[in-house]
């Protein structure tokens, strides 16, 4: 048994063009923290399993806010180290997938919304109680170092972590430097030492003065970068400078990246392009799977149909992504037309709309008369910000709905007398007044006052 | 689990009425917007009416307004359309969908088939 | 009202092929516009809304595009559950109305 130990030293934009910004802004804060995901490397089978050797969740980082203008930097990472108990023997090989999540924590809905910046994934030799090993990785634009190890938990010591070895309460007999083993009291065990000079970083032994190289590292004591040892790799103009006189073979010959990869060479290695669902230096390592638990947010995860996708998660109502960890700000596909305010309810979306304006999006025009019915006969009239009915005579009110007394307006004039009618109304007029309201005075002669044509 | 169970399809005759229900599950029913949507046999898909979360708004399309009603009782989680003056053209598997607001139509019933003929 | 015209009616093609179906809009509708997949006997299915976002639940293999009145569904990968009838639907105003629908059909 023992514990694998990952410390994050530095997450932040890569050299280079294209760096990214800060994922954060000052309008939408926001914090980090990883993943890591373990299994054995023992077999391209294994590279398959899921996260067989376990997984860890860091603690949230603290809060980080953009500051306009600056530039990009390592954003402020979570305290402590990532640890990841292992209850059998250390594989010595192992593949590890790291993740790097965002937690927003602006004004959503609901909570703060997650999202996946970036994974990276590889696989190595480590033996356990050795030192820690460095390590960079990049994932697009974004770079992440970090160191890990492997440490046996007492009483089990060894590269594996497989034998025992417990203290003992009677004076030890063992040498100096050398510790009382199970389960033969007077069987004394060496500490594991490397080839003297073995490089602490890139180097490691499983048995007494070996010194074996991490993935990326050559040479009897693991100091020469493979992409530098002897003048095999530069190539061109470059290879005057080691001695060489042919140029030896690139990086990419014979293609190093599995699973169907691409390779591009780097000024000083390669790097492989790795179809969907492949990641680490040499696209060997697999995609997640549903046992690794990717789907958040109470996402449903299911294998995938293709061999592209090893699993698909289902998500809940108000989340998307791949791993659902996206909250969907569905107001900001603005939903709501003709200037309508948008809540999200979390399970459905209201659109409160303005005057003369209506429909489950705003998107009916009140100005428009579609949907709308003026009753007894009553027509529908276009404009000034609402619609407006003309009703048949008789009838009045807003849609026409009310029966209208026709004399409550008073519409003879002069004195005339108004009287209800079943088509209208009837004026009669007092002496020396005539017309259908009473509007024209009648002359003493009996010409009336009509309006010259 | 959203469920939508549309009932009260059958055939009848032209100028004959018909009012067809869904009962809705599995959501705050009183939430949504819902709408009828019918579909002729061997046809596409025409919207038919919505109706607000509380009912005071509905439309329809041109070829029903003033035949067809569009109505709902949120205490008993139920959409109903009843149907008058019905015309051969209205024969159709008539489906009932909720409107969540960022789409009309997320959840659809199963669909009930109306026949008008003779 | 808005008419809604889809390309082609119908379609042919074969198990793991990528296919592209095409919807115009009579008039801009911003991106107000969904994807319906439909198989017989059956209800229709949300796929897309807003022209491109993926309904909850369907699978990245389908994706939209397009703004105004010229949109595109397309649908990678093909697999035997993929081959239906698909209708775009916009809901700029109303009525709202739907493309005639494209069978797409295995090879």
């Known amino acids: 048994a023992g514990v694998f130990e990952l410390q994050i030293h530095s997450f932040g934009p890569g050299p280079g063009p294209g760096a990214p910004r800060s994922p954060c802004s000052a309008r939408l804060p926001c914090r980090l923290f990883f993943r890591v995901c373990l299994k054995p490397g023992l077999s391209e089978e294994a590279a398959e399993s899921p996260c067989a050797l376990g997984a860890a969740l860091s603690a949230r980082g603290p809060v980080y806010t953009e500051q306009p203008g600056a530039p990009a930097p390592d954003l402020p990472l979570p305290d402590g180290l990532l640890q990841v108990p292992f209850r059998d023997a250390w594989p010595g090989t192992f593949s590890f997938i790291i993740e790097t999540w965002r937690e927003e924590l602006g004004d959503q809905i609901g909570g703060p919304a997650w999202s996946l910046l970036a994974r990276v994934a590889g696989r190595r030799r480590l033996a356990a109680g050795g030192p820690w090993a460095r390590d960079i990785q990049r994932a697009g634009a974004w770079e992440l170092r970090f160191s890990y190890r492997a440490r046996c938990e007492p009483p089990a010591v060894g590269t594996a972590c497989t034998r025992l070895c417990r203290p003992r309460s009677a004076p030890s007999r063992c040498g100096p430097g050398l510790r009382p083993c199970a389960p033969l009291e007077d069987e004394c065990e060496a500490p594991l030492v490397c080839r003297a000079g073995c490089s602490p970083e890139h180097g490691f032994c499983e048995q007494p003065g070996e010194c074996r190289c991490l993935e990326g590292w050559t040479g009897p004591l693991c100091t020469v970068p493979v992409s530098t040892s002897s003048c095999l790799s530069p190539r061109g103009p470059s290879s005057a400078t080691t001695g060489c006189l042919v140029p030896g073979p690139g990086p990419c010959d014979g293609n190093p990246c599995a699973n169907g990869g691409s390779c591009s060479e780097t000024p000083r290695s390669f790097e492989c392009t790795c179809p969907r669902g492949f990641y680490g230096l040499r696209c060997e390592v697999s995609g997640v799977t549903c046992a690794d638990g990717p789907c958040f947010n109470g996402g449903l995860c299911v294998g995938g149909a293709d061999p592209d996708s090893a699993y698909i998660c289902h998500c809940p109502p108000g989340f998307q992504g791949s791993n659902c960890e996206k909250r969907v700000d569905r107001c900001s596909l603005q939903p709501c037309r003709n200037g309508g305010l948008c809540l999200d309810l979390g399970h459905a979306l209201r659109c409160r709309c303005r005057a003369g304006f209506a429909g489950p999006r705003c998107e009916h025009d009140l100005d428009d008369c579609a949907g709308r019915a003026c009753a007894n006969g009553g027509t529908c009239v276009e404009g000034g910000g609402a619609h407006r009915c003309s009703c048949a005579l008789g009838f009045g009110g807003r849609d026409c709905r009310e029966r209208a007394d026709p004399c409550a307006a008073r519409p003879c004039a002069h004195g005339g007398r108004c009287y209800a009618h079943f088509s209208g109304l009837v004026c009669a007029c007092a002496p020396g007044y005539m017309g259908a309201r009473c509007e024209f005075p009648v002359h003493p002669d009996g010409a009336s006052a009509l309006p010259a044509a | 689990e959203v469920q939508l169970v549309e009932s009260g399809g059958g055939l009848v005759q032209p100028g004959g009425s018909q009012r067809l229900s869904c009962a809705a599950s599995?959501?705050?029913?009183?939430?949504?917007?819902m709408n009828w949507v019918r579909q002729a046999p061997g046809k596409g898909l025409e919207w038919v009416a919505n109706i607000k979360e509380d009912g005071s708004e509905k439309y329809y399309v041109d070829s029903v307004k003033g035949r067809f009603t569009i109505s709902r009782d949120n205490a008993k989680n139920s959409l109903y359309l009843q149907m008058n003056s019905l015309r051969a053209e209205d024969t159709a598997v008539y489906y009932c969908?909720?409107?969540?607001?960022?789409?009309?139509?997320?959840?659809w019933g199963q669909g009930t088939l109306v026949t008008v003929s003779s | 009202d808005i008419q809604m015209s889809q390309s082609p009616s119908s379609l042919s093609a074969s198990v793991g092929d990528r296919v592209t179906i095409t919807c115009r809009a009579s008039q801009g509708i911003s991106n107000y516009l969904a994807w319906f997949q439909q198989k017989p006997g059956k209800a229709p299915k949300s796929l897309i809304y807003?022209?491109?976002s993926l309904q909850s639940g369907v699978p990245s293999k389908f994706s939209g595009s397009g703004s105004g009145t010229d949109f595109t569904l397309a649908i990678s990968s093909l697999q035997p559950e993929d081959f239906a009838t698909y209708y775009c639907q916009q809901y700029n105003s109303f009525p709202y109305t739907f493309g005639q629908g494209t069978t797409l059909e295995i090879k």
């Open positions: 807003a022209a491109s």
């Open positions: 599995g959501f705050t029913f009183s939430s949504y917007w």
């Open positions: 969908a909720r409107d969540p607001g960022w789409a009309p139509f997320d959840y």
